[in-house]
């Protein structure tokens, strides 16, 4: 996340994530202003002459939704100001001189998670926004799958799941006759330092989405698809 | 940064073919949609065609369906107008844009973040 230190006794960090598509998500830490100062953050695009997006800070979270013309890409970057009023001005402070949205990702989940039981296994799919389409190589996913009773804390895990929008789980993956429940979350992944700067993505792990439920199969011989492992 | 160059434009008579290419700097070209547009002298520039970030999907103006085919090569991070059956009225400067689509149609100049300076195409009748 990025962090912008203001000055004085009213010091406060900024954190922003983007879900790289339309929307900046900002959280700051700081001692409460007075009441009817109304700060905000303000985007202003290092490329784009003229592209600024005002982030309205209610308490100690604001977001930023771009216009449809303004859909990240990978060169973006922004010089991001703290503005609020105090006796009647104006005070402006340097949050961050160069904030590179594609460092500070923090995606939406994955959506409409399904699955689809046969003899011996159970195919999971999902879905990604149409904006994250091109950038499918570059996504990393994180399975959990329980029994239905169970806590999440209780979870098998499963990662490393690149560029795919499904998995399978293997019947003896799974305790036959319970029912289930499967989640899935998704970040950027971390690519091989070879990759040019313009492809490397950083930041945090989406929430975790909606939860499916199936019911586990009975145990066969293991599915080999005809393409292979995920 | 994406930058756009266009080359292939030129003279040539009516019922004539010309192949204009739009080569990209820069590896994020696979991530994004690509189109053609072209303005003719007095006009507002206008969308030809476009395709998606894979190839696996491509749009036309009705005025040139049937005749131009856009294609692409994410290897050599090129794209390609393949214009065929040219009229005069085709006559235009053609820009090649690049673009996450999201939300807006590719036909919709606002879709694309970077433009080329463009290639002049007359066809002479």
């Known amino acids: 996340s990025v962090t912008g230190e203001g000055q004085g006794p009213r010091s406060r960090t900024f954190t922003c994530l983007t879900n790289n598509i339309l929307r900046i998500d900002c959280h700051w830490s700081a001692p409460e202003l007075g009441q009817g100062s109304s700060p905000w953050l303000l985007f202003t695009s290092n490329q784009a002459p003229g592209g600024t997006h005002k982030c309205i800070l209610r308490g100690s979270e604001c977001t930023v939704v771009l216009p449809p013309e303004a859909v990240l890409v990978p060169s973006d970057n922004f010089t991001i100001t703290f503005h609020h009023c105090m006796s009647g001005r104006e005070q402006v402070s340097l949050v961050d001189p160069e904030y590179l949205p594609r460092r500070h990702v923090k995606l939406d989940p994955p959506s409409d998670l399904q699955s689809n039981i046969s003899s011996g296994h159970c195919i999971l799919t999902w879905s990604i926004s149409p904006a994250l389409e091109p950038m499918t190589t570059l996504l990393s996913y994180e399975l959990a799958f329980k029994k239905q009773e169970e806590a999440w804390e209780q979870a098998q895990h499963r990662d490393h799941i690149v560029g795919v929008t499904w998995l399978i789980l293997e019947a003896f993956e799974l305790d036959p006759g319970f029912i289930h429940e499967a989640r899935l979350r998704v970040q950027m992944a971390t690519l091989e330092d070879d990759v040019v700067e313009e492809e490397r993505y950083t930041g945090q792990w989406s929430e975790w989405s909606q939860p499916v439920c199936f019911q586990a199969p009975q145990r066969q011989g293991p599915l080999i698809p005809p393409w292979g492992w995920p | 940064q994406v930058q756009l160059v266009e080359s292939g434009g030129g003279l040539v008579q009516a019922g004539g073919s010309l192949r204009l290419s739009c080569a990209a700097s820069g590896r994020s070209f696979k991530f994004y949609g690509m189109g053609w547009f072209r303005q003719a002298p007095g006009k507002e520039r206008e969308f030809v065609a476009a395709i998606s970030y894979n190839g696996g999907s491509t749009y036309y103006a009705d005025s040139v369906k049937g005749r131009f085919t856009i294609s692409r090569d994410n290897a050599k991070n090129t794209v390609y107008l393949q214009m065929n059956s040219l009229k005069p009225e085709d006559t235009a400067v053609y820009y090649c844009?690049?673009?996450?689509?999201?939300?807006?149609?590719?036909?919709?100049?606002?879709?694309?973040?970077?433009w080329g300076q463009g290639t002049q195409v007359t066809v002479s009748s």
């Open positions: 844009a690049a673009g996450r689509w999201y939300k807006l149609g590719p036909s919709e100049q606002r879709t694309y973040r970077y």
